[in-house]
């Protein structure tokens, strides 16, 4: 029980990783993280 | 021992700031997201604000986004949270909090408090 | 955001018996079979404590007289037998969703 990253997202799907605090879905090619999820596998808020 | 010591409370009047401080001691400061929580005089308990653990993502509850700041110096092991427009409302008991990471690091338990540190805004 | 309602506000019991606290969610805190909800335990002047995540599992150092179940949006913290040291507030937290919430307390009297 520590404070360390988990070595994997244990999420549907292929496309997440972990960005702050969650495993957030990535941004499709041309857009950029505005924020990242705010829950486990959740969506990142792209732009 | 886990310690966490806040600092830098005190009297301060509507639309004034303040830098709430946490210093950590007794464990690897840099491998924990950390939060602020305050505790209004009710007893009422509210989240203001998170860090990331690598110091890059912070998040807030709408209710004080554009207002607080939360930030971290792993160098020195402290937590910060500037506080800016400062309301009656925001008079609390603020207390800084470890967040340990459970399940596949996606869910986060406050398993450590400071004592906290008292905030009051008033004319 | 998720909010969580706690019951009761207060109550009493007496030296020895059983109390269960109840907290309830306004949607789902359940996510791959886990519950992300906390209880918590704090005496006059002190933080809060943790006693319980994930809807069941007892933090170290914690008396085996606290347990904690529920999934879903219906939690309940359980604590027998009371004794004398268990006076204080209770409070069930969510980490299901940001913003963290939690739900307004329920003081506990020993008679």
């Known amino acids: 029980q520590g404070g360390t990253r988990s070595p994997r997202c244990d999420c549907a799907g292929d496309f997440h990783k972990k960005i702050g605090l969650f495993c957030c879905r990535g941004c499709p090619a041309g857009h950029y993280l505005k924020a990242p999820c705010t829950e486990p596998c959740g969506n990142s808020t792209c732009l | 021992e886990v310690q966490l010591v806040e600092s830098g409370g005190g009297l301060v009047k509507p639309g004034g700031s303040l830098k709430l401080s946490c210093a950590a001691s007794g464990f690897t400061f840099s491998s924990y997201a950390m939060s602020w929580v305050r505790q209004s005089p009710d007893k009422r308990l509210e989240w203001v604000a998170e860090?990331?653990?690598?110091?890059?993502?912070?998040y807030y509850p709408d209710t004080v986004t554009g207002r607080f700041t939360i930030s971290r110096d792993n160098a020195k092991k402290t937590l910060y949270l500037e506080m800016s427009g400062l309301r009656s409302e925001d008079t609390a008991m603020y207390y800084c909090a470890r967040d340990r990471e459970a399940y596949y690091g996606q869910q986060y338990v406050m398993d450590y408090w400071g004592q906290g540190t008292s905030v009051t805004v008033s004319s | 955001d998720i909010v969580l309602t706690q019951s009761p506000a207060s109550l009493a019991v007496s030296l020895g018996l059983s109390v269960t606290i109840s907290c309830r969610a306004s949607?789902?805190?359940?996510?791959?079979?886990?519950?992300?909800l906390q209880w918590y335990q704090q005496k006059p002047g002190q933080p809060p404590r943790l006693l319980i995540y994930g809807s069941s599992t007892v933090e170290s150092g914690v008396p085996a007289r606290f347990s904690g179940s529920g999934s879903g949006t219906d939690f309940s913290l359980n604590i027998h037998p009371v004794e004398e040291d268990d006076s204080a507030m209770y409070f069930c937290?969510?980490?299901?969703?940001?913003?963290?919430?939690f739900g307004g307390g329920t003081k506990l009297e020993i008679k």
């Open positions: 937290q969510q980490s299901r969703r940001l913003p963290w919430t």
């Open positions: 860090i990331s653990s690598g110091d890059t993502y912070t």
């Open positions: 949607e789902s805190i359940e996510y791959s079979g886990t519950s992300f």
